[in-house]
């Protein structure tokens, strides 16, 4: 945020940039949290725009019985590994085809035991406040589907009649990692020493990090004709004086007519 300065007073202004603002020869360049000619004002809204998508990664192990393990499968650049990867990926794409959050699989390791496949199932969803629930549900469906396929697609008389066959008991979910996005935490951190006074409110499922000085939200402070200003002790209303009235009170809702004061009478609206 920048405020431009013209004229002789500019050099003076340079040494007076506040709150970590820096002079660039024309104006004070203010850090994210501040604005104003001298960076003296605290912003009322901080952009904590969420990521467009949130990801989850499930570490799974399955045992493929329709392929016999060979040493070449350890080498990720071998023809054997590449072919196995292609078939396994196609098979898993079929298994998880009904899960909208499913992105794909990534084989991390193949080892002996028929072929034990250590792999990640990758999930992704559009950010909404309910993303945790969406991804939790998706991971449950992944577990159900992989359990089902490894129970159904099994070798009969030493031959597999499916794209791949599995050992029913070789299916394990090792770990589930969900990308953490905590708008409240981000908001508090970015508001720094004003963190106690900034809150997250949602509009169209998008989080907004705002102080009570930002109008139009449920926590917004109504300063009436005054101006809301943030200080280290919280939001305060700076009341104005017009030609006819002085305004006072916590929300500048008390107007005193100047003529009455000059006539030694007080009158409150």
């Amino acid at each position: 945020r920048t405020t431009t300065c013209f004229g002789d007073g500019c050099q003076n202004t340079a040494s007076r940039c506040k709150n970590g603002g820096t002079w660039d020869g024309l104006k004070c360049q203010c850090p994210n949290l501040y604005y104003g000619e001298l960076c003296e004002e605290v912003v009322s809204s901080i952009d904590i725009g969420p990521p467009e998508t949130i990801s989850a990664q499930m570490e799974l192990t399955v045992t493929v019985t329709s392929v016999k393990f060979t040493e070449e499968l350890k080498n990720h650049s071998s023809q054997e590994f590449q072919e196995f990867k292609q078939t396994f990926t196609e098979q898993m794409n079929i298994v998880y085809s009904g899960i909208p959050e499913y992105v794909g699989v990534n084989i991390t390791k193949l080892r002996l035991g028929s072929v034990v496949v250590e792999h990640d199932v990758l999930l992704r969803t559009k950010y909404t406040p309910e993303y945790k629930t969406v991804l939790d549900n998706a991971t449950e469906v992944v577990k159900e589907k992989i359990t089902k396929v490894t129970t159904q697609q099994i070798m009969i008389n030493d031959i597999c009649s499916d794209m791949m066959c599995f050992n029913t008991t070789g299916t394990q979910v090792q770990n589930i990692t969900v990308t953490q996005y905590d708008p409240e935490e981000d908001c508090r951190k970015m508001a720094k020493e004003y963190g106690d006074y900034f809150v997250v409110e949602y509009r169209d499922q998008k989080p907004y990090c705002i102080s009570p000085c930002e109008p139009g939200f449920s926590v917004s402070k109504n300063c009436n004709l005054g101006k809301c200003q943030m200080s280290l002790s919280g939001p305060q209303c700076l009341c104005v004086t017009t030609e006819t009235h002085w305004y006072s009170g916590e929300t500048c809702n008390q107007g005193t007519q100047k003529s009455l004061v000059y006539g030694h009478h007080h009158h409150h609206h």
């Epitope: 016999k68 060979t70 072919e83 031959i159 597999c160 499916d162 791949m164 066959c165």
Partner: nanobody, 123 residues
Framework: DVQLVESGGGLVQPGGSLRLSCAAS????????MSWFRQAPGKEREGVAI???????GYADSVKGRFTISQDNAKNSLYLQMNSLRAEDTAVYYC?????????????????WGQGTMVTVSS
């Protein structure tokens, strides 16, 4: 690029025999697997027989005891000896190969294919 070429198809009477051959462009599959599939008119492709580099062989129930799969690694060739042929054996026969030591007779498990050779069993 891997190439597989089948030969040996033709017209044969019920009860007769036929030997199919498949020539691979190199010996790439000597450490993997090779197989025969067939596709009758209007039907899905189905597995017939499989042989792996470890010597293991497997057959579809419908051909067990009648067909024999074998390979000659020195000649990079695969064979299918078909005896006691029946009308229902009529189909296009395909050779398939894999770098993997497979135990699967599902066409989706196989990545490399020949163009096929026609076998007609009819009197």
């Amino acid at each position: 690029d891997v190439q597989l070429v089948e030969s040996g198809g033709g017209l044969v009477q019920p009860g007769g025999s036929l030997r199919l051959s498949c020539a691979a462009s190199d010996n790439t599959f000597s450490r993997g697997s090779m197989s025969w599939f067939r596709q009758a008119p209007g039907k899905e492709r189905e597995g017939v027989a499989i042989i792996s580099s470890d010597g293991w062989t497997g057959y579809a129930d419908s051909v067990k005891g009648r067909f024999t799969i074998s390979q000659d690694n020195a000649k990079n060739s695969l064979y299918l000896q078909m005896n006691s042929l029946r009308a229902e054996d009529t189909a296009v026969y395909y050779c398939a190969a894999s770098f993997l030591v497979l135990r699967a007779l599902n066409p989706k498990a196989w990545h490399y294919w020949g163009q096929g050779t026609m076998v007609t069993v009819s009197s």
